[in-house]
């Protein structure tokens, strides 16, 4: 027995107390307006399509449609008794995108199209999304609209993030093949791009791809190998979107940051995290440059976003994504350093300014504390049994450190007979001494290494 659920109340005149399916009239295989229940709610009948008359003797509207009398009053049993006719109108008024890639004015029109399609033995049309095809549905009151501040930042900065590809020549055929890629970001409307120096290393042809897919040959304008910053230039007609540099000196630990890069054509990769430590002395983290500082973050920095910007929630660049030491520890070159580089680069190109020399050995390091040592020991079983010293994150190729035999993961524990407690100690000795006789803990043995610092441009 069918219940009379869904039937209008009060009951329409002449309805049986119980529904008897056997007494329902046969229905055609296809209904233009879809199926509906009759006025009594007993039998399935063909509903009237959108725009058709309803009420009176016309029968009910199809699925998703409601019977509306003039002035927009929905038809009820009372209206019907007053013998007024209405029109079938879709209960949903917003556009929808169908699986056939067509935009329909409302859900009812999509359903009608789906029925027509099935009648022709084609796949049904289903709803892919609310709103027109190719257009997101933006409900300004939705939670995702209100609280996706990371996505807002990404949307704002992405057009100025570029994909950089390097090509090498095969040794005999001289054919060019891609060898590496990284990211960069545009800093001037006429096509100056900042990236890591290690992204655009020597002997390679550099190609830049913008977010819109346009590709350009890039010229290397200036490189600071020690600070790991490079400036490259593309020739582009018209204005390019740019990113502004924020003040890394004003960063606070705990601030949200977003690392973005473009590791593949037309695609961005986004990671997010917080600032763990601001301005780790370089000094603390390395000697590409003795006054170099780094921002430490737990936002994942990898080959894909290396060279790309690390931005704050205002979309300002506060660093260049530069390297990952180990899980959860990544570093960025602070924007204040980028500003300095850009200013000096401008001066150099304008008037070939003389530069004072600095001493350099070619390592990146960080001060080892007991907690940091424990963390590293947990990750690497063979990490040395030390709780202080200067931990070497990276040895830069073709530098005094490499020539002397320093290796990644070494811990410097003394130089010229003086014990080394922190990375600062190493920086200070480099400034003073012309020869560094180091004792280095490697695994569980102590090794004597001699490094001769070289004088470099800052």
């Amino acid at each position: 027995q069918l219940s009379r659920a869904g039937r209008s109340a009060p009951l329409a005149a002449g309805c049986p107390d119980r529904c008897e399916p056997a007494r329902c009239p046969p229905q055609p295989e296809h209904c233009e307006g879809g199926r509906a229940r009759d006025a009594c709610g007993c039998c399935e009948v063909c509903g009237a399509p959108e725009g058709a008359a309803c009420g009176l003797q016309e029968g009910p509207c199809g699925e998703g449609l409601q019977c509306v009398v003039p002035f927009g009053v929905p038809a009820s049993a009372t209206v019907r008794r007053r013998a007024q006719a209405g029109l079938c109108v879709c209960a949903s008024s917003e556009p929808v995108c169908g699986s056939d890639a067509n935009t329909y004015a409302n859900l009812c029109q999509l359903r009608a199209a789906s029925r027509r399609s099935e009648r022709l033995h084609r796949p049904p049309v289903i709803v892919l999304q609310r709103g027109a095809c190719g257009q997101g549905q933006e409900d300004p009151n939705s939670l995702r609209h209100k609280y996706n501040f990371i996505a807002d930042v990404v949307e704002k900065i992405a057009p100025a993030v570029v994909h950089i590809e390097l090509f090498r020549k095969l040794p005999f055929s001289k054919r060019e093949v891609p060898v590496a890629s990284g990211s960069g970001f545009i800093v001037s409307e006429d096509g100056l791009i900042v990236t890591n120096a290690h992204v655009v290393t020597n002997k390679h042809r550099v190609k830049v791809e913008l977010k819109n897919g346009a590709t350009y040959e890039a010229k290397i304008k200036d490189v600071d190998e020690k600070a790991d910053i490079a400036l490259i230039k593309i020739d582009h007609q018209g204005k390019l979107p740019v990113l502004l540099l924020g003040r890394s000196s004003e960063l606070r630990p705990g601030e949200f940051v977003v690392a973005i890069g473009s590791p593949f054509s037309l695609q961005n990769t986004v990671t997010t995290g917080i600032v763990s430590t601001t301005q780790r002395g370089g000094k603390e983290l390395g000697l590409r440059n003795s006054d170099m500082d780094y921002i430490q973050t737990d936002a994942i920095i990898n080959y894909g976003n290396s060279g790309g910007p690390l931005v704050n929630l205002d979309g300002e660049v506060i660093g260049i994504n530069t390297l990952k030491v180990t899980a959860g520890i990544s570093f960025a070159i602070p924007s204040d350093k980028i500003k300095k580089f850009l200013t000096e680069s401008h001066d150099r190109q304008a008037k070939g300014k003389a530069i004072t020399k600095k001493k350099y050995i070619g390592i990146r390091m960080m001060s080892l504390t007991s907690s940091k040592a424990k963390e590293l020991k947990d990750r690497h079983r063979d990490f040395p049994d030390v709780i202080s010293g200067a931990y070497i994150i990276e040895v830069i190729p073709d530098t005094p450190a490499e020539a002397g035999g320093l290796k990644e993961n070494d811990v410097i524990i003394s130089i010229n007979g003086q014990s080394v407690v922190s990375a600062n100690d190493v920086s200070d000795v480099i400034k003073r001494e012309s020869t560094l006789n180091m004792v280095v803990r490697r695994g569980n043995e102590d090794i004597m290494i001699t490094v001769i610092p070289e004088e470099i441009d800052p």
């Epitope: 095969l170 040794p171 005999f172 055929s173 054919r175 290393t201 390679h204 190729p397």
Partner: antibody
């Protein structure tokens, strides 16, 4: 992981030809040149030639010019080295080896090698 | 053609010893490469671009030099280091040194 698998040992008569194959896997075959290096018993390694699998372009050691032919089948990711007019001094282990490249310095070397194919030339 | 002279052609050392092999070339090259070859096996790259350690190679192996004179060093010889070592340059085309056979005393 990168693997180069060579065909099996061959015994040939003087004057004959030998064709050794090298099937590559684990990398984009057309992004690197494939080289052939041989080692006669108790001798140093000797470079024979190379091929760019994408274009079929080749380079040969003058010592073997006219006797060695290197080819490649892109669809099968396989390189071939054919040495003709064999003589007893061609008895050696023949290796295919992939050209490696140093990103930092831009230098070339051989980073992956096949297991070697012993070719014995004897009457 | 660039001529390569590797010395010594053979050497015997004890476990724990520091071992040095030299390679001289007839005209200046940018980089030197070093390989290890064990009997019946293909050569294995140890050092590239003169001084860079190839992936997975123990840190006891090192290389140095420039121009025409290059050095390969094993800081503390291990039993598994018994092999023949080759230097290789690549200017016009690749050539190899004649090899140094290393044995344990």
């Amino acid at each position: 992981q990168v693997q180069l698998v060579q065909s099996g040992a061959e015994v040939k008569k003087p004057g004959a030809s030998v064709k050794v194959s090298c099937k590559a896997s684990g990398y984009t075959f057309t992004d690197y040149e494939m080289h052939w290096v041989r080692q006669a018993p108790g001798q140093r390694l000797e470079w024979m030639g190379a091929i760019d699998p994408e274009t079929g372009g080749t380079a040969y050691n003058q010592k073997f010019k006219g006797r060695v032919t290197i080819t490649a089948d892109k669809s099968a990711s396989t390189a071939y080295m054919e040495l003709s007019s064999l003589r007893s001094e061609d008895t050696a282990v023949y290796y295919c080896t992939r050209e490696g490249y140093s990103y930092e310095g831009g230098g070339y070397y051989f980073d992956y090698w096949g297991q070697g194919t012993l070719v014995t030339v004897s009457s | 053609d660039i001529q390569m002279t590797q010395s010594p052609s053979s050497l015997s050392a004890s476990v724990g010893d520091r071992v040095t092999i030299t390679c001289s070339v007839s005209s200046s090259v940018s980089y030197m490469y070093w390989y290890q070859q064990k009997p019946g096996k293909a050569p294995k790259l140890l050092i590239y671009d003169t001084s860079n350690l190839a992936s997975g190679v123990p840190s006891r192996f090192s290389g140095s030099g420039s121009g025409t004179d290059f050095t390969f060093t094993i800081s503390s010889l291990q039993p598994e280091d018994i092999a023949t070592y080759y230097c290789q340059q690549w200017s016009d085309y690749p050539t190899f040194g004649q090899g140094t056979k290393l044995e344990i005393k």
